[in-house]
């Protein structure tokens, strides 16, 4: 069954955590649907963003952080492992020095930590997708 | 009650027709939610677009057409009559030479016809909004 979109969940992240998302674009790539995943510092959507991951399907991916309300330097990738009309599985793993983003099991993007992952309190998944799975797994201590 | 988004409806337009849309952004303007309204030439979403109207709430509006699969010259406006967190009523009227877009009763944007409005067969409303009303009114002959 489908999860509501925008989908918001409280989360605590640290090295070893993985956020897994399964979904499908709501439109054909010609129409450039978006997927966005934001790791927020508070439960409020207007809070700062430790890791902003935005896919413009068929075109590009941008990653960034929002600190003290201001967007910082954007990182852009033309790598596009997503398939038009197909379901995707996205996993974002917290490594010691960066986030590693896997798409359908394939390492596709990395983003160096600018803010400690421990600052994350909420994850939001939204824009032009249907969402079937959201999970945060924690490293067993 | 809410209409599904993306929302698609068959439509025939001509001078005097008005498309009315009522909705609300799904996120605060800081997070730049989008609203998109597309007037398509076929019932298929990959068809050409006679009038493409995209709002990046709080930032800008872009208008364009997609002809033979290719986007043409974009028209951009910084006019932003939409209010953060507030419901909006959008009406797009077909005038003899252009589309006139009203936001909350105020004339806000115009877009000259590039393709005959009679070519429109479908209207799609989508992206980051909740939708409470969609109506196409036809000029009484």
């Amino acid at each position: 069954s489908l999860l509501p979109v925008p989908y918001t969940e409280a989360a605590s992240l640290s090295t070893g955590s993985t956020v897994t998302i399964k979904g499908r674009p709501l439109a054909c790539f010609l129409n450039e649907p978006y997927l966005q995943v934001d790791f927020h510092t508070e439960m409020k959507e207007e809070s700062d963003i430790v890791f902003h991951f935005q896919v413009c399907f068929g075109r590009r991916v941008v990653m960034n952080s929002r600190e003290y309300g201001a967007w910082k330097q954007q990182v852009e990738s033309k790598n596009m492992p997503f398939q038009d009309g197909q379901e995707f599985e996205l996993s974002i793993s917290v490594l010691p020095d960066k986030y590693q983003v896997m798409v359908n099991g394939q390492s596709s993007y990395t983003f160096d930590h600018r803010i400690k992952p421990e600052a994350v309190k909420m994850v939001q998944v939204w824009r032009d997708i249907s969402l079937t799975k959201f999970n945060v797994s924690y490293l067993k201590r | 009650s809410l209409l599904p988004v993306p929302y698609t409806e068959a439509a025939s337009l001509s001078t005097g027709s008005t498309v009315t849309i009522k909705g609300r952004p799904l996120a605060c303007f800081l997070n730049e939610p989008y609203l998109q309204v597309d007037f398509h030439t076929e019932m298929k979403e990959e068809s050409d677009i006679v009038f493409h109207f995209q709002v990046c709430f709080g930032r800008r509006v872009v208008m364009n057409s997609r002809e033979y699969g290719a986007w043409k010259q974009q028209v951009e406006s910084k006019n932003m009559p939409f209010q953060d967190g507030q419901e909006f009523e959008l009406s797009i009227s077909v005038l003899p030479d252009k589309y006139q877009v009203m936001v909350n009763g105020q004339s806000s944007y115009t877009f000259d016809h590039r393709i005959k409005p009679e070519a429109v067969k479908m209207v799609q409303v989508w992206r980051d909004i909740s939708l409470t009303k969609f109506n196409v009114s036809y000029l009484k002959r």
Partner: antibody, heavy 121, light 107 residues
Framework: QVQVQESGPGLVKPSQTLSLTCTVS??????????WSWIRQSPGKGLEWIGA???????YYSPSLKSRTSISRDTSNNQFTLQLSSVTPEDTAVYYC?????????????WGQGTQVTVSS | SSALTQPSAVSVSLGQTARITCQGG??????VSWYQQKPGQAPVLVIY???GRPSGIPERFSGSSSGDTATLTISGAQAEDEADYYC??????????FGGGTHLTVL
């Protein structure tokens, strides 16, 4: 093993432009995610970050020195250069270049030995 | 003036524990690093990312941070630890700041 070495004139006249070069060996300045910084230490004072150039070529400057600072690079010689304009005696300091892996707010693991710059007429 | 505040001097008896604090940063957001500097030498990284210790740095050096305060701890201070210590962190991800420095005296 990465090594960084500063070079440049030890004496600069007031109002002139100070120019220092940092030569990097044992690693490329274009290697992903590394940032190459200039840091200075005035006599008897603490450390002050001046600015940096990223692996991508993008530059960052301390807000307090931004109007006078320019950092550029020469990838063929694996060097990056600091230019500080309109210097005054307050710019007298030991100038260090350093490597900061994984972002500006991270840490500096390799430092040059420093070069003394005196601003005096 | 430094965005990060350190005590100008700290004294410790040989073999005892020294603690040097660094205040005023947003250590909930940004990592803190610590550097040791001896006279006439370049700074040396002793702690990175709050509590990481580079290879070659003795185990007696450790770091922690909470809220707006970060602490460098030297357990069992040795004579060779006498030096100036600087904390460093971000004021945003594209700007970095240092503390004013602390002179550690080993008695």
């Amino acid at each position: 093993q990465v090594q960084v070495q500063e070079s440049g004139p030890g004496l600069v006249k007031p109002s002139q432009t100070l120019s220092l070069t940092c030569t990097v060996s044992g690693g490329s300045i274009t290697t992903n995610y590394f940032y190459w910084s200039w840091i200075r230490q005035s006599p008897g004072k603490g450390l002050e970050w001046i600015g940096a150039i990223a692996y991508s070529g993008r530059t960052y400057y301390s807000p307090s020195l931004k109007s006078r600072t320019s950092i550029s690079r020469d990838t063929s010689n694996n060097q990056f250069t600091l230019q500080l304009s309109s210097v005054t005696p307050e710019d007298t300091a030991v100038y260090y270049c350093a490597r900061g892996p994984k972002g500006l707010a991270s840490y500096y693991d390799y430092w040059g030995q420093g070069t003394q710059v005196t601003v005096s007429s | 003036s430094s965005a990060l505040t350190q005590p100008s001097a700290v004294s410790v008896s040989l073999g005892q524990t020294a603690r040097i604090t660094c205040q005023g940063g947003n250590f909930g957001y940004y990592y803190v690093s610590w550097y040791q500097q001896k006279p006439g030498q370049a700074p040396v990284l002793v702690i990175y990312r709050d509590s990481g210790r580079p290879s070659g740095i003795p185990e007696r050096f450790s770091g922690s941070s909470s809220g707006d305060t970060a602490t460098l701890t030297i357990s069992g201070a040795q004579a060779e630890d006498e030096a100036d210590y600087y904390c460093q962190s971000g004021s945003s991800s594209d700007n970095t700041v240092f503390g004013g420095g602390t002179h550690l005296t080993v008695l």
